[in-house]
Interface confidence: medium
Protein backbone atom coordinates (compact mmCIF):
# COMPACT_ATOMS: atom_id res chain seq x y z
CA UNK A 1 0.00 0.00 0.00
CA UNK A 2 2.99 2.35 0.37
CA UNK A 3 3.88 5.00 -2.22
CA UNK A 4 7.24 6.32 -3.31
CA UNK A 5 8.47 9.18 -5.47
CA UNK A 6 9.29 12.83 -4.95
CA UNK A 7 5.93 14.31 -5.96
CA UNK A 8 2.70 13.69 -4.13
CA UNK A 9 -0.79 14.71 -5.10
CA UNK A 10 -3.79 15.26 -2.86
CA UNK A 11 -6.29 12.41 -2.76
CA UNK A 12 -9.49 12.77 -0.74
CA UNK A 13 -11.96 10.10 0.33
CA UNK A 14 -15.20 10.15 2.31
CA UNK A 15 -16.22 7.41 4.74
CA UNK A 16 -19.51 5.91 3.67
CA UNK A 17 -21.97 3.08 4.15
CA UNK A 18 -23.45 0.58 1.74
CA UNK A 19 -26.93 -0.90 1.85
CA UNK A 20 -26.74 -4.69 1.40
CA UNK A 21 -28.20 -5.78 -1.94
CA UNK A 22 -28.15 -2.29 -3.40
CA UNK A 23 -25.46 -0.34 -5.25
CA UNK A 24 -22.97 1.79 -3.33
CA UNK A 25 -20.42 4.51 -4.01
CA UNK A 26 -16.88 4.68 -2.60
CA UNK A 27 -15.98 8.36 -2.98
CA UNK A 28 -12.51 9.48 -4.02
CA UNK A 29 -11.28 12.68 -5.68
CA UNK A 30 -7.82 13.82 -6.73
CA UNK A 31 -5.97 16.73 -8.36
CA UNK A 32 -6.98 16.37 -12.01
CA UNK A 33 -4.60 15.79 -14.90
CA UNK A 34 -5.08 17.16 -18.39
CA UNK A 35 -4.25 13.84 -20.03
CA UNK A 36 -6.50 10.84 -19.34
CA UNK A 37 -3.88 8.37 -20.57
CA UNK A 38 -1.53 9.48 -17.76
CA UNK A 39 -4.03 8.69 -14.98
CA UNK A 40 -3.98 5.39 -13.10
CA UNK A 41 -6.62 4.60 -10.47
CA UNK A 42 -6.23 1.59 -8.20
CA UNK A 43 -8.71 0.58 -5.55
CA UNK A 44 -7.40 -1.87 -2.95
CA UNK A 45 -8.97 -3.44 0.12
CA UNK A 46 -7.46 -4.80 3.31
CA UNK A 47 -7.65 -8.56 3.46
CA UNK A 48 -8.11 -8.99 -0.29
CA UNK A 49 -5.48 -10.73 -2.39
CA UNK A 50 -6.07 -8.96 -5.72
CA UNK A 51 -7.28 -5.51 -6.69
CA UNK A 52 -10.78 -4.17 -6.20
CA UNK A 53 -10.54 -2.17 -9.43
CA UNK A 54 -7.94 -0.65 -11.74
CA UNK A 55 -8.41 2.05 -14.38
CA UNK A 56 -5.48 3.02 -16.59
CA UNK A 57 -4.87 4.51 -20.05
CA UNK A 58 -8.49 5.55 -20.22
CA UNK A 59 -10.04 2.13 -19.60
CA UNK A 60 -10.59 -0.58 -17.01
CA UNK A 61 -7.71 -3.02 -16.45
CA UNK A 62 -9.24 -5.91 -14.55
CA UNK A 63 -6.73 -8.76 -14.97
CA UNK A 64 -5.72 -8.48 -11.30
CA UNK A 65 -9.23 -7.92 -9.97
CA UNK A 66 -10.13 -10.12 -7.02
CA UNK A 67 -12.88 -12.63 -7.70
CA UNK A 68 -15.15 -11.24 -4.97
CA UNK A 69 -15.45 -7.95 -6.91
CA UNK A 70 -15.66 -9.39 -10.42
CA UNK A 71 -18.47 -7.82 -12.42
CA UNK A 72 -19.45 -5.51 -9.54
CA UNK A 73 -17.22 -2.43 -9.93
CA UNK A 74 -17.02 0.57 -12.22
CA UNK A 75 -15.46 4.01 -12.17
CA UNK A 76 -17.16 7.05 -13.69
CA UNK A 77 -14.92 7.03 -16.77
CA UNK A 78 -16.14 10.35 -18.13
CA UNK A 79 -15.38 12.07 -14.81
CA UNK A 80 -11.85 10.74 -14.25
CA UNK A 81 -10.36 13.62 -16.24
CA UNK A 82 -11.86 16.11 -13.75
CA UNK A 83 -10.46 14.25 -10.75
CA UNK A 84 -13.27 11.87 -9.82
CA UNK A 85 -11.93 8.39 -8.96
CA UNK A 86 -15.07 7.25 -7.13
CA UNK A 87 -15.97 3.60 -7.43
CA UNK A 88 -19.46 2.26 -8.02
CA UNK A 89 -19.98 -1.04 -6.24
CA UNK A 90 -22.92 -3.12 -7.43
CA UNK A 91 -24.98 -5.42 -5.21
CA UNK A 92 -23.25 -4.53 -1.94
CA UNK A 93 -22.45 -7.56 0.25
CA UNK A 94 -21.96 -7.72 4.00
CA UNK A 95 -18.34 -8.77 3.35
CA UNK A 96 -17.62 -5.59 1.37
CA UNK A 97 -17.14 -3.74 4.67
CA UNK A 98 -13.60 -2.72 5.56
CA UNK A 99 -10.75 -0.36 4.76
CA UNK A 100 -10.23 0.58 1.11
CA UNK A 101 -7.37 2.51 -0.40
CA UNK A 102 -7.81 4.84 -3.38
CA UNK A 103 -4.37 5.03 -5.01
CA UNK A 104 -3.77 7.54 -7.81
CA UNK A 105 -0.91 8.04 -10.24
CA UNK A 106 -0.84 11.03 -12.61
CA UNK A 107 1.85 12.93 -14.50
CA UNK A 108 2.04 15.23 -11.46
CA UNK A 109 2.81 12.47 -8.98
CA UNK A 110 1.22 9.87 -6.74
CA UNK A 111 -1.15 9.91 -3.81
CA UNK A 112 -3.51 7.75 -1.82
CA UNK A 113 -6.16 7.92 0.86
CA UNK A 114 -7.97 5.34 2.94
CA UNK A 115 -11.72 4.99 3.19
CA UNK A 116 -13.75 3.17 5.83
CA UNK A 117 -16.72 1.43 4.26
CA UNK A 118 -19.47 0.06 6.44
CA UNK A 119 -22.13 -2.31 5.20
CA UNK A 120 -25.51 -3.05 6.64
CA UNK A 121 -29.15 -2.62 5.84
CA UNK A 122 -31.30 0.40 6.57
CA UNK A 123 -34.72 1.47 5.40
CA UNK A 124 -37.37 4.08 6.05
CA UNK A 125 -39.87 3.25 8.75
CA UNK A 126 -43.56 3.67 8.14
CA UNK A 127 -45.83 4.46 11.07
CA UNK A 128 -49.52 3.60 10.84
CA UNK A 129 -52.52 3.57 13.12
CA UNK A 130 -53.41 -0.04 13.85
CA UNK A 131 -57.18 -0.09 13.50
CA UNK A 132 -57.34 -3.83 14.24
CA UNK A 133 -56.05 -3.42 17.78
CA UNK A 134 -58.35 -3.37 20.79
CA UNK A 135 -56.99 0.00 21.95
CA UNK A 136 -55.41 3.01 20.24
CA UNK A 137 -52.19 1.57 18.82
CA UNK A 138 -49.43 2.67 16.44
CA UNK A 139 -47.44 0.23 14.34
CA UNK A 140 -43.95 1.13 13.07
CA UNK A 141 -42.52 -1.08 10.31
CA UNK A 142 -39.20 -1.01 8.46
CA UNK A 143 -38.49 -3.78 5.96
CA UNK A 144 -34.68 -4.17 6.06
CA UNK A 145 -32.16 -3.55 8.85
CA UNK A 146 -28.79 -5.05 9.78
CA UNK A 147 -27.15 -5.23 12.28
CA UNK A 148 -30.11 -5.46 14.65
CA UNK A 149 -31.13 -1.91 15.55
CA UNK A 150 -32.59 -0.34 18.64
CA UNK A 151 -36.10 1.08 18.48
CA UNK A 152 -37.20 4.01 20.65
CA UNK A 153 -40.55 5.76 20.70
CA UNK A 154 -40.95 9.44 21.57
CA UNK A 155 -43.83 11.89 21.62
CA UNK A 156 -44.12 15.64 21.23
CA UNK A 157 -46.52 16.05 24.13
CA UNK A 158 -44.77 13.73 26.58
CA UNK A 159 -41.19 14.80 25.90
CA UNK A 160 -38.64 12.67 27.74
CA UNK A 161 -41.19 9.96 28.51
CA UNK A 162 -40.03 6.33 28.47
CA UNK A 163 -42.34 4.27 26.25
CA UNK A 164 -40.52 0.94 26.69
CA UNK A 165 -43.24 -0.35 29.04
CA UNK A 166 -46.03 0.39 26.57
CA UNK A 167 -44.31 -0.76 23.38
CA UNK A 168 -43.27 -4.08 21.92
CA UNK A 169 -40.58 -4.58 19.26
CA UNK A 170 -39.88 -7.67 17.19
CA UNK A 171 -37.28 -8.56 14.56
CA UNK A 172 -38.12 -11.00 11.80
CA UNK A 173 -35.32 -12.48 9.66
CA UNK A 174 -35.82 -11.85 5.95
CA UNK A 175 -35.56 -14.59 3.36
CA UNK A 176 -31.87 -13.95 2.56
CA UNK A 177 -31.05 -14.73 6.24
CA UNK A 178 -29.09 -11.54 6.86
CA UNK A 179 -31.38 -8.53 7.07
CA UNK A 180 -34.41 -8.30 9.32
CA UNK A 181 -37.81 -6.69 9.28
CA UNK A 182 -38.42 -4.41 12.24
CA UNK A 183 -41.90 -4.12 13.74
CA UNK A 184 -42.63 -2.04 16.81
CA UNK A 185 -46.06 -1.50 18.33
CA UNK A 186 -46.90 1.40 20.68
CA UNK A 187 -49.97 1.03 22.91
CA UNK A 188 -52.16 3.58 24.76
CA UNK A 189 -51.77 6.27 22.13
CA UNK A 190 -53.46 9.61 22.84
CA UNK A 191 -55.02 11.80 20.18
CA UNK A 192 -53.73 15.26 19.20
CA UNK A 193 -50.12 14.20 19.53
CA UNK A 194 -47.10 13.53 17.30
CA UNK A 195 -45.25 10.24 17.85
CA UNK A 196 -41.82 9.32 16.55
CA UNK A 197 -40.47 5.83 15.96
CA UNK A 198 -36.65 6.02 15.92
CA UNK A 199 -34.66 3.07 14.55
CA UNK A 200 -30.87 3.14 14.86
CA UNK A 201 -27.82 0.91 14.42
CA UNK A 202 -24.15 1.79 13.88
CA UNK A 203 -24.79 2.41 10.17
CA UNK A 204 -27.90 4.56 10.07
CA UNK A 205 -30.62 6.30 12.03
CA UNK A 206 -34.18 6.54 10.70
CA UNK A 207 -37.22 8.26 12.11
CA UNK A 208 -40.86 7.86 11.24
CA UNK A 209 -43.24 10.51 12.59
CA UNK A 210 -47.00 10.36 12.73
CA UNK A 211 -49.31 13.18 13.82
CA UNK A 212 -52.70 11.94 14.95
CA UNK A 213 -55.58 14.39 15.38
CA UNK A 214 -59.37 13.97 15.25
CA UNK A 215 -59.48 15.28 11.71
CA UNK A 216 -56.29 14.02 10.08
CA UNK A 217 -53.19 11.81 10.13
CA UNK A 218 -49.88 13.22 8.87
CA UNK A 219 -46.70 11.18 8.34
CA UNK A 220 -43.06 12.05 7.75
CA UNK A 221 -39.91 9.88 7.46
CA UNK A 222 -36.22 10.68 7.59
CA UNK A 223 -33.07 8.55 7.23
CA UNK A 224 -29.54 9.62 8.09
CA UNK A 225 -26.30 7.67 7.58
CA UNK A 226 -24.02 7.82 10.62
CA UNK A 227 -20.25 8.43 10.82
CA UNK A 228 -19.90 9.68 7.25
CA UNK A 229 -16.97 12.07 7.38
CA UNK A 230 -14.22 13.34 5.11
Amino acid sequence: FGISGRHSITVTTVASAGNIGEDGILSCTFEPDIKLSDIVIQWLKEGVLGLVHEFKEGKDELSEQDEMFRGRTAVFADQVIVGNASLRLKNVQLTDAGTYKCYIITSKGKGNANLEYKTGAFSMPEVNVDYNASSETLRCEAPRWFPQPTVVWASQVDQGANFSEVSNTSFELNSENVTMKVVSVLYNVTINNTYSCMIENDIAKATGDIKVTESEIKRRSHLQLLNSKA
Partner: antibody, heavy 116, light 107 residues
Protein backbone atom coordinates in the same frame (compact mmCIF):
# COMPACT_ATOMS: atom_id res chain seq x y z
CA UNK B 1 -17.21 -30.43 -10.03
CA UNK B 2 -14.80 -27.89 -8.55
CA UNK B 3 -11.53 -29.68 -7.85
CA UNK B 4 -7.88 -29.09 -6.95
CA UNK B 5 -5.33 -31.89 -7.29
CA UNK B 6 -1.79 -31.56 -5.94
CA UNK B 7 1.19 -33.58 -7.15
CA UNK B 8 4.98 -33.53 -7.01
CA UNK B 9 5.56 -34.43 -3.37
CA UNK B 10 8.09 -37.04 -2.28
CA UNK B 11 11.23 -37.74 -0.30
CA UNK B 12 14.10 -35.30 -0.74
CA UNK B 13 17.40 -34.71 1.04
CA UNK B 14 18.09 -31.51 2.99
CA UNK B 15 19.23 -28.80 0.58
CA UNK B 16 17.36 -30.43 -2.28
CA UNK B 17 14.53 -29.11 -4.44
CA UNK B 18 10.98 -30.10 -5.37
CA UNK B 19 8.29 -28.58 -7.54
CA UNK B 20 4.69 -29.04 -6.48
CA UNK B 21 1.81 -28.67 -8.91
CA UNK B 22 -1.88 -28.05 -8.31
CA UNK B 23 -4.23 -28.78 -11.20
CA UNK B 24 -7.54 -26.93 -11.08
CA UNK B 25 -10.77 -27.96 -12.76
CA UNK B 26 -14.46 -27.13 -12.64
CA UNK B 27 -14.05 -23.34 -12.27
CA UNK B 28 -12.48 -20.35 -14.02
CA UNK B 29 -8.99 -20.70 -12.58
CA UNK B 30 -7.76 -17.37 -14.01
CA UNK B 31 -10.36 -15.47 -11.95
CA UNK B 32 -9.15 -16.63 -8.53
CA UNK B 33 -6.21 -15.98 -6.28
CA UNK B 34 -4.60 -19.15 -4.87
CA UNK B 35 -2.80 -20.20 -1.69
CA UNK B 36 -0.38 -22.89 -0.55
CA UNK B 37 -0.87 -24.08 3.03
CA UNK B 38 1.11 -26.81 4.79
CA UNK B 39 0.66 -29.05 7.80
CA UNK B 40 3.59 -30.74 9.54
CA UNK B 41 2.91 -34.22 10.98
CA UNK B 42 0.66 -33.90 14.04
CA UNK B 43 0.72 -30.10 13.85
CA UNK B 44 -1.62 -27.32 12.83
CA UNK B 45 -2.06 -25.42 9.57
CA UNK B 46 0.58 -22.98 8.35
CA UNK B 47 0.14 -20.55 5.46
CA UNK B 48 3.02 -20.70 2.96
CA UNK B 49 2.31 -18.38 0.03
CA UNK B 50 -0.40 -16.63 -1.99
CA UNK B 51 -0.70 -15.43 -5.58
CA UNK B 52 -3.34 -13.21 -7.15
CA UNK B 53 -5.32 -14.12 -10.27
CA UNK B 54 -2.83 -12.75 -12.79
CA UNK B 55 0.32 -13.11 -10.65
CA UNK B 56 0.65 -9.39 -9.95
CA UNK B 57 0.47 -9.82 -6.17
CA UNK B 58 2.58 -12.48 -4.45
CA UNK B 59 3.10 -13.00 -0.72
CA UNK B 60 5.25 -15.45 1.28
CA UNK B 61 5.57 -16.57 4.87
CA UNK B 62 8.91 -15.47 6.40
CA UNK B 63 9.84 -19.12 6.95
CA UNK B 64 9.98 -19.79 3.18
CA UNK B 65 10.89 -16.38 1.74
CA UNK B 66 13.86 -16.60 -0.58
CA UNK B 67 13.60 -20.39 -0.85
CA UNK B 68 10.12 -21.02 -2.24
CA UNK B 69 8.52 -19.51 -5.35
CA UNK B 70 4.80 -19.53 -6.06
CA UNK B 71 3.68 -19.20 -9.67
CA UNK B 72 0.79 -20.09 -11.93
CA UNK B 73 0.02 -20.84 -15.55
CA UNK B 74 -3.54 -19.76 -16.27
CA UNK B 75 -3.45 -21.34 -19.73
CA UNK B 76 -2.83 -24.71 -18.07
CA UNK B 77 -5.10 -24.10 -15.03
CA UNK B 78 -2.15 -24.98 -12.81
CA UNK B 79 -0.57 -23.52 -9.67
CA UNK B 80 3.05 -24.27 -8.76
CA UNK B 81 5.32 -24.15 -5.72
CA UNK B 82 9.02 -24.36 -6.45
CA UNK B 83 10.80 -25.36 -3.25
CA UNK B 84 14.59 -24.96 -3.03
CA UNK B 85 17.08 -25.35 -0.15
CA UNK B 86 14.68 -27.68 1.61
CA UNK B 87 15.04 -28.24 5.35
CA UNK B 88 13.79 -30.92 7.72
CA UNK B 89 11.23 -28.45 9.09
CA UNK B 90 9.64 -28.20 5.62
CA UNK B 91 8.39 -31.77 6.03
CA UNK B 92 4.60 -31.54 5.76
CA UNK B 93 1.49 -32.19 3.74
CA UNK B 94 1.16 -29.33 1.27
CA UNK B 95 -2.31 -28.18 0.25
CA UNK B 96 -3.33 -25.76 -2.47
CA UNK B 97 -6.49 -23.76 -1.79
CA UNK B 98 -8.64 -21.35 -3.76
CA UNK B 99 -8.85 -17.77 -2.51
CA UNK B 100 -12.45 -16.63 -2.35
CA UNK B 101 -14.44 -15.68 0.72
CA UNK B 102 -12.05 -17.76 2.77
CA UNK B 103 -10.07 -20.68 1.39
CA UNK B 104 -13.19 -22.27 0.02
CA UNK B 105 -11.79 -25.15 -2.05
CA UNK B 106 -8.84 -27.34 -1.01
CA UNK B 107 -6.88 -30.09 -2.69
CA UNK B 108 -6.31 -33.45 -1.02
CA UNK B 109 -2.67 -32.58 -0.26
CA UNK B 110 0.73 -33.93 -1.31
CA UNK B 111 3.33 -35.11 1.18
CA UNK B 112 6.85 -33.66 1.21
CA UNK B 113 9.45 -35.42 3.38
CA UNK B 114 12.86 -33.83 3.86
CA UNK B 115 15.27 -36.35 5.35
CA UNK B 116 18.76 -37.67 4.88
CA UNK C 1 2.61 -10.80 12.79
CA UNK C 2 -0.88 -11.38 14.16
CA UNK C 3 -1.08 -14.29 16.59
CA UNK C 4 -4.27 -16.31 16.77
CA UNK C 5 -4.98 -18.16 20.03
CA UNK C 6 -7.73 -20.75 20.26
CA UNK C 7 -9.28 -22.16 23.41
CA UNK C 8 -9.69 -24.77 24.52
CA UNK C 9 -7.05 -26.82 22.70
CA UNK C 10 -9.29 -29.86 23.09
CA UNK C 11 -12.70 -30.66 24.50
CA UNK C 12 -14.88 -33.71 25.06
CA UNK C 13 -18.56 -33.50 24.26
CA UNK C 14 -21.56 -35.69 23.57
CA UNK C 15 -23.90 -35.80 20.60
CA UNK C 16 -26.54 -33.09 21.04
CA UNK C 17 -24.29 -30.84 23.14
CA UNK C 18 -23.83 -27.15 22.41
CA UNK C 19 -20.13 -26.54 21.76
CA UNK C 20 -18.34 -23.19 21.80
CA UNK C 21 -14.78 -22.58 20.61
CA UNK C 22 -13.12 -19.20 21.02
CA UNK C 23 -10.37 -17.53 19.03
CA UNK C 24 -8.47 -14.44 20.09
CA UNK C 25 -6.33 -12.24 17.82
CA UNK C 26 -3.28 -10.38 19.15
CA UNK C 27 -4.63 -7.18 17.55
CA UNK C 28 -7.88 -6.09 15.98
CA UNK C 29 -8.66 -7.94 12.75
CA UNK C 30 -12.16 -6.41 12.40
CA UNK C 31 -14.24 -9.26 10.94
CA UNK C 32 -11.51 -10.82 8.77
CA UNK C 33 -11.76 -14.27 10.30
CA UNK C 34 -12.53 -17.72 8.88
CA UNK C 35 -13.28 -21.03 10.59
CA UNK C 36 -12.28 -24.44 9.19
CA UNK C 37 -13.05 -28.04 10.11
CA UNK C 38 -10.49 -30.78 9.52
CA UNK C 39 -10.90 -34.51 9.94
CA UNK C 40 -7.90 -36.90 10.23
CA UNK C 41 -6.21 -37.50 6.88
CA UNK C 42 -8.46 -35.00 5.10
CA UNK C 43 -8.10 -31.45 3.83
CA UNK C 44 -9.63 -28.62 5.85
CA UNK C 45 -13.15 -27.48 4.99
CA UNK C 46 -14.34 -23.86 5.18
CA UNK C 47 -17.26 -23.43 7.59
CA UNK C 48 -17.55 -19.72 8.31
CA UNK C 49 -16.06 -16.73 6.51
CA UNK C 50 -15.94 -13.06 7.49
CA UNK C 51 -16.52 -14.03 11.14
CA UNK C 52 -20.21 -14.87 10.84
CA UNK C 53 -21.13 -15.79 7.25
CA UNK C 54 -22.05 -19.44 6.76
CA UNK C 55 -20.31 -21.07 3.80
CA UNK C 56 -22.67 -22.58 1.24
CA UNK C 57 -23.55 -26.19 2.02
CA UNK C 58 -22.53 -26.00 5.70
CA UNK C 59 -25.26 -27.03 8.17
CA UNK C 60 -26.96 -24.18 10.02
CA UNK C 61 -26.00 -25.66 13.40
CA UNK C 62 -22.61 -23.96 12.82
CA UNK C 63 -22.46 -20.25 13.54
CA UNK C 64 -19.75 -17.67 14.05
CA UNK C 65 -19.71 -14.39 15.92
CA UNK C 66 -17.37 -11.66 17.10
CA UNK C 67 -15.29 -8.82 15.71
CA UNK C 68 -12.10 -7.02 16.63
CA UNK C 69 -10.07 -9.46 18.69
CA UNK C 70 -12.56 -11.99 20.10
CA UNK C 71 -14.41 -14.57 18.03
CA UNK C 72 -16.57 -17.61 18.68
CA UNK C 73 -17.53 -20.70 16.70
CA UNK C 74 -20.68 -22.38 18.01
CA UNK C 75 -22.11 -25.78 17.14
CA UNK C 76 -25.66 -25.63 18.45
CA UNK C 77 -26.24 -29.40 18.59
CA UNK C 78 -23.19 -31.58 18.07
CA UNK C 79 -23.60 -34.37 15.53
CA UNK C 80 -21.45 -37.52 15.14
CA UNK C 81 -19.85 -36.13 11.98
CA UNK C 82 -18.75 -32.95 13.82
CA UNK C 83 -16.00 -34.67 15.81
CA UNK C 84 -12.92 -33.07 14.24
CA UNK C 85 -10.31 -30.35 14.71
CA UNK C 86 -11.38 -26.73 14.18
CA UNK C 87 -9.09 -23.88 13.14
CA UNK C 88 -9.59 -20.12 13.01
CA UNK C 89 -7.63 -18.05 10.48
CA UNK C 90 -7.17 -14.31 10.06
CA UNK C 91 -6.82 -12.65 6.67
CA UNK C 92 -6.62 -9.06 7.84
CA UNK C 93 -2.95 -8.89 6.89
CA UNK C 94 -0.09 -11.06 5.70
CA UNK C 95 1.29 -13.32 6.92
CA UNK C 96 -2.05 -15.12 7.06
CA UNK C 97 -2.14 -16.95 10.38
CA UNK C 98 -4.13 -19.84 11.84
CA UNK C 99 -5.01 -20.69 15.41
CA UNK C 100 -3.37 -23.81 16.83
CA UNK C 101 -6.59 -25.78 16.52
CA UNK C 102 -9.27 -27.17 18.84
CA UNK C 103 -9.88 -30.91 18.83
CA UNK C 104 -13.49 -31.89 19.54
CA UNK C 105 -13.60 -35.47 20.85
CA UNK C 106 -16.37 -37.86 21.86
CA UNK C 107 -17.04 -37.94 25.59
Amino acid sequence: EVQLLESGGGLVQPGGSLRLSCAASGFTFSSYGMHWVRQAPGKGLEWVASISSSSGYIYYADSVKGRFTISRDNSKNTLYLQMNSLRAEDTAVYYCARASSGMDVWGQGTTVTVSS
Amino acid sequence: DIQMTQSPSSLSASVGDRVTITCRASQSIRSYLNWYQQKPGKAPKLLIYYASSLQSGVPSRFSGSGSGTDFTLTISSLQPEDFATYYCQQYYSTPLTFGQGTKVEIK
